[in-house]
């Protein structure tokens, strides 16, 4: 009986035990993007660096091609920031003719890819108005949340305009994933 | 054969399992900062509750001298929120001179401080420009990933200017990390 | 002695262990808001899809009337997102009689509600002005931290204005916890 | 109302120590941070510390740093202002007041205590 | 070391208009919480008259207001009254969070 002796009361038998350590895990940092050809309606992917610094992948969690690549089926947080920065919008002209500007935005959208599903799923959307009045800003967007994810699904991070990115520092820009 | 019964298939025989319920744990809130002086181009420091209201750390996790001490080694989410409010920032007079101004802004660190090592790492920044029209304003910028981190390791939160950070409630500004 | 083998040297006898995949979880995510009586100085309570899409609650974390009821006791993450959007606030005038008006605001809290206890605790806040400029706005608030809670807690997002929360899409306005 | 009734004058020697009161009525004492402002006669304010009454947490000005205590009684809604090492210059009227806690401002004001150091 | 400075003194006659400036040292003055402003009547203790550079708390009458532009901060007081004379004291916090006075300005109503 000594093997049973931490097992809660509520423990279904089938529910395994797995040490903590040994779960899918990431954290990807921003590395500057390659010119792509991306079309007109479709957020481009950001690309990662997944072993340099602050980044790393362990656990059977791989990152390729844009893609964190997910191991094993379950219970996954998932979060990203992005920081974008670019030079004052035509919004801040504050009114042309006399009426308002329809506003320029920055997106973030964390996607979720399933080769048996035809269509990406977007988990997570974060977007925001930009309107600003100074010479240049710059402004983070960040995402967390929990998902249910199968053995293959495929992680990416989709911005509405990949120039807007700042990729100069890897704690300003990141991507990452870990099994509950 | 008892023991093993819940040992999933992959489970590694060197990986302890251990409770969730004694892994190191903090969550600190904000406190009104005392007045320090501090150098010209280096990001103060905030210090923290670490035991009234919503505030504590567990589990060997210690708060000490505005740093979070950890105990062991391993993979931990650390977040933080920091909510600033100020007076209109001078960017707000909009064009001086006929052209905009470089625009004040408002940035979160969190910082590893590893014994060894000379040189603090930066884990987490957020930063964004303030341009405001507005008499005052007030936002948050929040912060959260996960790190490999080793024992010993130093964590603490740094701000661009301590005296636009809202001290008034704990659930506005806010550090914590939690052992995956 | 075979059952003891996973157990690191500094694991309490008494703390159970036990699997990660019945412990409690849930994710909501965005419904269109019925119009509901609240009262002046008092944020009204978001209520969620809790089972159609992205959404799940799973191991006895329940969703009812705006409330996810926590069933055991522990520390848990939990999070949201608010997407507010709006048409442009009256601050955007700049200056009305030579001074500057006081800004909207967008405002989200988590809030813990316990039976035996007469107030509701805020345990998170994400409070921003709104002083835009264009002629409509959108952005994000994010808020997430480690709690502990009590079995029977209850938990709610509230808004400082539901007309202007974003429904139209489950990945920008969302709300989640989950036991570590 | 909000009120905020200060302790009587008191006459020190030089080198002594001087614990002034303020007790608070009219509202949740541990809600509101207490300042203490001092004023030598015929000059300006000037600003001592202030004091978390919930926390018992202060933050002093650096020209007070060791020989300024601030401390609360919560039971009796009292805050108390304690300074060591009296000299002639300190001969002042020590003010507490109540601060706005969004934008700092001293809303409320007691009568003050004037502090007389003599040898 | 940040300082707040404010006119000695200044006068008007009853029903003029009378404005007091606070100059600041330091542009970090007031980014946080604004400028304040105080008035001393003689024998009493101060009282707030403006929080934030605009803000009147209740039952302040209108015509003192506040104002900001760049580092300075100004405190006007129109239709002037023989009972505004007294002291007024500029306030605000610095980037080390210290609370700083201005060094008082004395207003003297004349006739």
């Known amino acids: 009986l000594k093997g049973q002796e931490f097992a809660p009361s509520h423990q279904q038998v089938y529910a395994p035990l797995r040490a903590d350590g040994d779960k899918p895990r990431a954290h990807l940092t921003v590395v500057r993007q390659t010119p792509t050809q991306h079309f007109k309606n479709q957020f481009p992917a950001l690309h990662w660096e997944h072993e340099l610094g602050l980044a790393f992948t362990k656990n059977r969690m791989n990152y390729t091609n844009k893609f964190l690549l997910i191991p094993e089926s379950g219970d996954y947080f998932i979060y990203s920031q992005v920081t974008f920065r670019g030079m004052t919008s035509e919004c801040s002209e504050i009114r042309q003719a006399g009426r308002p500007n329809k506003p320029d935005s920055i997106t973030v959208v964390i996607t979720k890819v399933t080769d048996s599903y035809p269509e990406p799923t977007q988990l997570l959307m974060g977007t925001k108005s930009v309107c600003e009045v100074g010479s240049n800003w710059f402004q983070p967007i960040y995402l967390g949340a929990m998902f249910s994810l199968q053995e293959g699904d495929k992680l990416m991070v989709n911005v509405s305009d990949i120039s807007l990115v700042d990729y100069t520092k890897e704690d300003k820009t990141f991507f990452g994933a870990f099994l509950l | 054969l008892k023991g093993q019964e819940f040992a999933p298939s992959h489970q590694q025989v060197y990986a302890p399992l251990r409770a969730d319920g004694d892994k190191p744990r903090a969550h600190l809130t904000v406190v009104r900062q005392t007045p320090t002086q501090h150098f010209k181009n280096q990001f103060p420091a905030l210090h923290w509750e670490h035991e009234l209201g919503l505030a504590f750390t567990k589990n060997r996790m210690n708060y000490t001298n505005k740093f979070l001490l950890i105990p062991e080694s391993g993979d931990y989410f650390i977040y933080s929120q920091v909510t600033f409010r100020g007076m209109t920032s001078e960017c707000s007079e909009i064009r001086q001179a006929g052209r905009p101004n470089k625009p004040d802004s408002i940035t979160v660190v969190i910082t590893k401080v590893t014994d060894s090592y000379p040189e603090p790492t930066q884990l987490l920044m957020g930063t964004k420009s303030v341009c405001e029209v507005g008499s005052n304003w007030f936002q948050p910028i929040y912060l959260g990933a996960m790190f490999s981190l080793q024992e010993g390791d130093k964590l603490m939160v740094n701000v661009s200017d301590i005296s636009l950070v809202d001290y008034t409630k704990e659930d506005k500004t806010f550090f914590g990390a939690f052992l995956l | 002695l075979k059952g003891q083998e996973f157990a690191p040297s500094h694991q309490q006898v008494y703390a159970p262990l036990r699997a990660d995949g019945d412990k409690p979880r849930a994710h909501l995510t965005v419904v269109r808001q019925t119009p509901t009586q609240h009262f002046k100085n008092q944020f009204p309570a978001l209520h969620w899809e809790h089972e159609l899409g992205l959404a799940f609650t799973k191991n006895r974390m329940n969703y009812t009337n705006k409330f996810l009821l926590i069933p055991e006791s522990g520390d848990y993450f939990i999070y949201s997102q608010v997407t507010f959007r709006g048409m442009t606030s009256e601050c955007s005038e700049i200056r009305q009689a030579g001074r500057p008006n006081k800004p909207d605001s967008i405002t989200v809290v988590i809030t813990k509600v316990t039976d035996s206890y007469p107030e509701p605790t805020q345990l998170l806040m994400g409070t921003k002005s709104v002083c835009e400029v264009g002629s409509n706005w959108f952005q994000p608030i994010y808020l997430g931290a480690m709690f502990s809670l009590q079995e029977g807690d209850k938990l709610m997002v509230n808004v400082s204005d539901i007309s202007l929360v974003d429904y139209t899409k489950e990945d920008k306005t969302f709300f989640g916890a989950f036991l570590l | 109302q909000v009120q905020l009734v200060q302790s009587g004058a008191e006459v020190k020697k030089p080198g002594a120590s001087v614990k002034v009161s303020c007790k608070a009525s009219g509202y949740t004492f541990t809600s509101y941070d207490i300042n203490w402002v001092r004023q030598a006669p015929g000059q300006g304010l000037e600003w001592m510390g202030w004091l978390n009454p919930n926390s018992g947490y202060t933050g002093y000005a650096q020209k007070f740093q060791g020989r300024v205590t601030m401390t609360a009684d919560r039971s009796t809604s009292t805050a108390y202002m304690e300074l060591s090492s009296l000299r002639s210059e300190d001969t002042a009227v020590y003010y507490c007041a109540r601060e706005v806690p969004e934008t700092a401002a001293f809303e409320y004001w007691g009568q003050g205590t004037l502090v007389t150091v003599s040898s | 070391q940040s300082v707040l400075t404010q006119p000695p003194s200044v006068s008007g006659a009853p029903g003029q208009r009378v404005t007091i400036s606070c100059t600041s040292s330091s542009s970090d003055i007031g980014a946080g919480q604004g400028v304040h402003w105080y008035q001393q009547l003689p024998g009493t203790a101060p009282k707030l008259l403006i929080e934030?550079?605009?803000n009147r708390p209740s039952g302040v009458p209108d015509r003192f207001s506040g104002s900001k532009s760049g580092t300075s901060a100004s405190l006007t007081i129109t239709g002037l009254l023989p009972e505004d004379e007294g002291d007024y004291y500029c306030?605000?916090?610095?980037?080390?969070?210290?609370?700083?006075f201005g060094g008082g300005t004395k207003l003297t109503v004349l006739g």
């Open positions: 934030g550079y605009y």
């Open positions: 306030q605000s916090w610095d980037g080390t969070l210290s609370a700083l």
